[in-house]
């Protein structure tokens, strides 16, 4: 019952991570315009990894795609590559552990495959957590050091008394996103690979072996010796159904950053 | 269309008070921005507050914080300046305007004006 | 505040003319977000409110006459009348539409001979 649970609880909040992963690649409010102890303007910057947006203050929001692949930064191509490396593996992830939920029965298909099968997935998913939360890190990363660049040099002097504004941005709403849904992804993985020790079958892995003594035909079995410890509780054939994993929908609505008053 | 019609000339006394109107109509009144510009004689032209009637979120000048206030009256889509402890140098044509949708903050529409005169 | 100067403040011309007016302004007024300038410019006659003529420097409203020309970028802006008509006759403003608080120029006062 427990492996059950704990298997259909990594499903579910692995779920739920990876559309946080993949709602964070396609968000527009990775970076955002600081409004900090910086000139107030009548403009709003705000910039994804696919385009670059611009609300005025009447409300009015012009986004620009980034159409050039050669003119962009490596990091935000190698961002890009591990959100979408993550997208990729977290779905297959999500593939493989459905069929390898305990609750579904498909077939005839054996308790080692599904061990097998949710550890798959479960590896999946760590690694599918781990490429979000490296990309947002390295986002994040890349926007400290270009802030306190612009900060140094933030009034940049143009002859005489003319000068011109640079335009700071600090974390926008798709990073903290990104984490957080990139965690949620670890953490149902290693639910999976936790359910995937519980589920191995446990007298599978040593097969009987026969002793012939003179005048006697002993089979002996060893009996009190687990592969590996802590294989979990020994369930021997006793075979345990849960009725489906129970899901949670999460709706979530992202406030406009900057409210014009 | 669009229409933007102020109340009438003002004469008042120093140290007192008075509200201008601003009427609008022909767009939908809470989705805009309703400006009010200063305008001394022969003078050029001076920003001093914004309202968002939708939400009453409004945007001060400095200079004109605790002199101006405003408001926005959803039913009748008229927005108010009230000018307060007024001074000779608030003598003025003041005007209301809206912002613009997709117009770089630009003010698309202007009322006709409502001159201020301030004398004992 | 963002200081806007205009020049000149008068121009005295002949129907037919090339006028050109210039507006700077203490600040870059130029969004790297979208690479448009925040720059607004009016038309104001007698008695009249100011009309809007131009927006992000060089967009002309719409019932804006083609002889009206707006360039410029960053922190120095110029309004353009290719032949000036007697209905041109006015006092024309440029407006800094990026910094709050917004701020206008002194105007250019267009006379005729």
């Known amino acids: 019952m427990a492996v059950t649970a704990c298997q259909g609880l990594g499903f579910v909040v692995s779920l739920i991570g990876i559309a946080g992963i993949i709602a964070a690649t396609c968000m527009d409010q990775w970076s955002t315009q600081d409004l900090y102890n910086n000139p107030v303007t009548a403009v709003f910057n705000y910039q994804g990894l696919w385009r670059s947006c611009v609300r005025e203050s009447s409300g009015f929001t012009e986004c620009r795609g980034y159409f050039t692949l050669l003119g962009l930064p490596a990091m935000l191509q190698a961002v890009r590559a591990l959100m979408i490396v993550g997208i990729v593996l977290g779905a297959i992830g999500l593939l493989v552990s459905i069929f390898a939920l305990k609750c579904i029965r498909i077939g005839s298909m054996e308790d080692s495959a599904k061990a097998n099968m949710t550890l798959t997935s479960g590896i999946m998913f760590i690694v599918s957590g781990l490429c979000a939360i490296a990309g947002v890190s390295v986002f994040a990363n890349m926007l400290v050091t270009n802030f306190w660049m612009s900060t140094a040099n933030m009034y940049t002097g143009m002859g005489g008394m003319v000068q011109t504004v640079q335009t700071r941005y600090t974390f926008g709403a798709a990073l903290f996103v990104g984490w957080v849904a990139g965690g949620l992804t670890l953490i149902g993985g290693v639910m999976m690979c936790i359910a995937c020790r519980g589920l191995a079958p446990e007298e599978t892995n040593y097969k009987a072996v026969s002793y012939h003594a003179s005048g006697h035909s002993v089979a002996y079995k060893p009996g009190g010796f687990k592969a590996s410890t802590g294989f979990g509780s020994n369930t021997k054939n006793k075979k345990i159904y849960d009725g489906g994993a129970r899901t949670e929908d999460e709706v979530q609505s992202y406030p406009s950053k900057h409210d014009y008053v | 269309q669009v229409q933007l019609k102020q109340s009438g000339p003002e004469l008042v006394r120093p140290g007192a008070s008075v509200k201008l109107s601003c009427k609008t109509s022909?767009?939908?009144?809470?989705?805009?921005?309703i400006h009010w510009v200063k305008q001394r004689s022969g003078q050029g032209l001076e920003w001093v507050v914004r309202i968002y009637p939708g939400t009453g979120n409004t945007y001060y000048n400095e200079k004109f914080t605790g002199k101006a206030t405003l408001t926005a009256d959803k039913s009748s889509s008229t927005a108010y300046m009230q000018l307060s402890s007024l001074k000779y140098e608030d003598s003025a044509v003041y005007f209301c305007?809206?912002?613009?949708?997709?117009?770089?903050?630009?003010?698309?529409?202007w009322g006709q004006g409502t001159s201020v005169t301030v004398s004992s | 505040d963002i200081v806007m100067t205009q020049s000149p403040s008068s121009l005295t011309v002949t129907a037919g003319e090339k006028v050109t007016m210039n507006c700077k302004s203490s600040?870059?007024?130029?969004?790297?977000?979208?690479?448009?300038?925040?720059l607004t410019w009016y038309q104001q006659k007698p008695g009249q409110p100011p009309k809007l003529l131009f927006y992000w420097a060089s967009t002309r409203e719409s019932g804006v006459p083609d002889r009206f020309t707006g360039s410029g970028s960053g922190t120095d802006f110029t309004l353009t009348i290719s032949s000036v008509q007697a209905e041109d006759l006015a006092v024309y403003h440029c407006?800094?539409?990026?910094?709050?608080?917004?701020?206008f120029g002194g105007g250019t006062k267009l006379e005729m001979k």
């Open positions: 305007s809206r912002e613009g949708y997709g117009k770089g903050n630009s003010m698309d529409y």
């Open positions: 600040q870059s007024l130029l969004n790297s977000g979208n690479q448009k300038n925040y």
């Open positions: 407006q800094n539409a990026y910094y709050y608080p917004y701020t």
């Open positions: 022909g767009y939908i009144f809470t989705n805009y921005w």
